[in-house]
C-alpha cells in the first residue's frame, strides 16, 4: 500500500523530521506550514489548524520560506553617492550600490553601508591598480620614460614622445615637446580608450567625489591626457 | 632605472619553508607594487600575489594563499615572498616585479631558484 | 580563472620576416593585456601594455592590438635577437594569469 500523504498540521513520527517548506511548533507539537517569500505568520499553527499567512506590508520583506509573526524592515532609502541596485519589495530587501567614481568603503551583508569616491592620481601618478567595487585605486608614479599629465582615478602613464630634435625633456608629469619636426609615438594610433575601474591607498592623490570619465586620446598632441585604466583585476 | 636584485638560489626538503628576497634599488619601493611570478621548470610564468609597501596591502593567487606570504620592508626596499609546506612542483624560478602607474610590470628580479629535493 | 592560450606554441620565421603572434582570453579582458619577451635564463621584460601601448625603449617594430578576447603581438620585421618566448598576461581580474607562451624560433 503507498503511504498516505500527511496534511499539515500532523505529528511527526518519532525520530523524524518534518518535510520541506514546513516547520515544527514546540507548542503544538505538530508539523505546520512555513509561509512563503512576502508573507509572515498572523496566526501560528494549533494541534487542529494550519499556520495562517498574511502578506508583508509597505517597506517590508520576507525572503525565505518562514514563520515568523512580522516581516523584516527594508534598508533606509540610498544615500546620493548611491544607486538602487534592487528595490525594496515584499520579497526582497533594498540593495544600495556605490555609483560610477565610488567604490564600497564599508559593506554589509547585501550591497554597501558606506561608500567612498575613488582616488586620482595626481600629475606624474598613474594608476597601477584600478578602483573595483569594493576597493579604491592604488596610485603610483611614473616609471622613467613615461608621463601622466592628468587628476584622474582612470588614467595610466604611457611614454614619452620620441623627438628628432627635443625641445623640452619629458618627465613625469609632462610628455616630451618636440621640435618643429613630426614626432614618433610609442604606440599604435586610435589605440586605448578604456572603461574603469583593485586595490590601495597611496600618499599622492586626493580623493574627490566626481567620477573620472577620461577624455578620447590624442597621441599626436605632447600634452594630450593619459589613456585611463581599464577595470582591471576585481576582488 | 629601477633595479630589483634577489637573493640566491636555495635548496629545500619537502614540508621546509623558502624566504626569497628582493631589493629594489635606484627608486623606493613605495613607488612601486611588487609582484611575485612562479616559473616551473620548462613551464610557463604563474602569478603569486603582490604586495603595496606603502601601505602592505597584499592580494594572492588563490592557488598559493594558504601557503605564501608577501611582506615589504621600507627601510631597506626590500620585498619578501615566503612559501610554506614545499612540495616537489614547487622547483621553480621565482621573480620578484615591480609595477609602477604604468599598470604593467615594467621591470623584473633575475630570478630566484628553488629545488625542493628529498 | 581566465584562461589565456597563445598560438602557435612555436613560430619559425626567417629573420626580416613578420611574425604574428595570437593570444586569446577564455572571457572578455577589454584591453588589460601586457605582452612579455623572454630569452633563455633571462627575465621577462615588458614589449606591450594595456594591449597597444609599447613600453619605453621597445623598438618600433613591435607593435600589439586587439580587445575583448582576441590580441595580437606583431614584429613587423625580425631581427636576430626577437627570437625569444613570448608570453601574454590579461590583469582584468583575479588571478592574474599568462598564457603559455610562443616560441619563435629561425626558419
Known amino acids: 500500500l503507498p503511504a498516505q500523504v500527511a496534511f499539515t498540521p500532523y505529528a511527526p513520527e518519532p525520530g523524524s523530521t518534518c518535510r520541506l517548506r514546513e516547520y515544527y511548533d514546540q507548542t503544538a507539537q505538530m508539523c505546520c506550514s512555513k509561509c512563503s517569500p512576502g508573507q509572515h505568520a498572523k496566526v501560528f499553527c494549533t494541534k487542529t489548524s494550519d499556520t495562517v499567512c498574511d502578506s508583508c506590508e509597505d517597506s517590508t520583506y520576507t525572503q525565505l520560506w518562514n514563520w515568523v509573526p512580522e516581516c523584516l524592515s527594508c534598508g533606509s532609502r540610498c544615500s546620493s553617492d548611491q544607486v538602487e541596485t534592487q528595490a525594496c519589495t515584499r520579497e526582497q530587501n533594498r540593495i544600495c550600490t556605490c555609483r560610477p567614481g565610488w567604490y564600497c568603503a564599508l559593506s554589509k551583508q547585501e550591497g554597501c553601508r558606506l561608500c567612498a569616491p575613488l582616488r586620482k592620481c595626481r600629475p606624474g601618478f598613474g594608476v597601477a591598480r584600478p578602483g573595483t567595487e569594493t576597493s579604491d585605486v592604488v596610485c603610483k608614479p611614473c616609471a622613467p620614460g613615461t608621463f601622466s599629465n592628468t587628476t584622474s582615478s582612470t588614467d595610466i602613464c604611457r611614454p614619452h614622445q620620441i623627438c628628432n630634435v627635443v625641445a623640452i625633456p619629458g618627465n613625469a608629469s609632462m610628455d616630451a615637446v618636440c621640435t618643429s619636426t613630426s614626432p614618433t609615438r610609442s604606440m599604435a594610433p586610435g589605440a586605448v580608450h578604456l572603461p574603469q575601474p583593485v586595490s590601495t591607498r597611496s600618499q599622492h592623490t586626493q580623493p574627490t567625489p566626481e567620477p573620472s570619465t577620461a577624455p578620447s586620446t590624442s597621441f599626436l598632441l605632447p600634452m594630450g591626457p593619459s589613456p585611463p585604466a581599464e577595470g582591471s583585476t576585481g576582488d | 632605472e629601477v633595479q630589483l636584485v634577489q637573493s640566491g638560489a636555495e635548496v629545500k626538503k619537502p614540508g621546509a619553508t623558502v624566504k626569497i628576497s628582493c631589493k629594489v634599488s635606484?627608486?623606493?619601493?613605495?613607488?612601486?607594487?611588487l609582484h611575485w611570478v612562479q616559473q616551473a621548470p620548462g613551464k610557463g610564468l604563474e602569478w603569486m600575489g603582490w604586495i603595496d609597501p606603502e601601505d602592505a596591502k597584499t592580494k594572492y593567487g588563490q592557488k598559493f594563499q594558504s601557503r605564501v606570504t608577501i611582506t615589504a620592508d621600507t627601510s631597506t626596499d626590500t620585498a619578501y615572498m615566503e612559501l610554506s609546506s614545499l612540495r616537489s612542483e614547487d622547483t621553480a624560478v621565482y621573480y620578484c616585479?615591480?609595477?609602477?602607474?604604468?599598470?604593467?610590470?615594467?621591470?623584473w628580479g633575475q630570478g630566484t631558484l628553488v629545488t625542493v629535493s628529498s | 580563472d581566465i584562461v589565456m592560450t597563445q598560438s602557435p606554441a612555436t613560430l619559425s620565421v626567417s629573420p626580416g620576416e613578420r611574425a604574428t603572434l595570437s593570444c586569446k582570453a577564455s572571457?572578455?579582458?577589454?584591453?588589460?593585456v601586457d605582452w612579455y619577451q623572454q630569452k633563455p635564463g633571462q627575465s621577462p621584460r615588458v614589449l606591450i601594455y594595456k594591449a597597444s601601448i609599447r613600453y619605453t625603449g621597445i623598438p618600433a617594430r613591435f607593435s600589439g592590438s586587439g580587445s575583448g578576447t582576441e590580441f595580437t603581438l606583431t614584429i613587423s620585421i625580425l631581427q636576430s635577437e626577437d627570437f625569444a618566448v613570448y608570453f601574454c598576461?590579461?590583469?582584468?581580474?583575479?588571478?592574474?594569469?599568462f598564457g603559455q607562451g610562443t616560441k619563435l624560433e629561425i626558419k
Open positions: 635606484g627608486y623606493s619601493i613605495t613607488d612601486y607594487l
Open positions: 572571457q572578455n579582458v577589454g584591453s588589460n
Open positions: 598576461m590579461q590583469s582584468k581580474s583575479y588571478p592574474i594569469t
Open positions: 616585479a615591480a609595477q609602477s602607474g604604468t599598470g604593467t610590470m615594467d621591470a
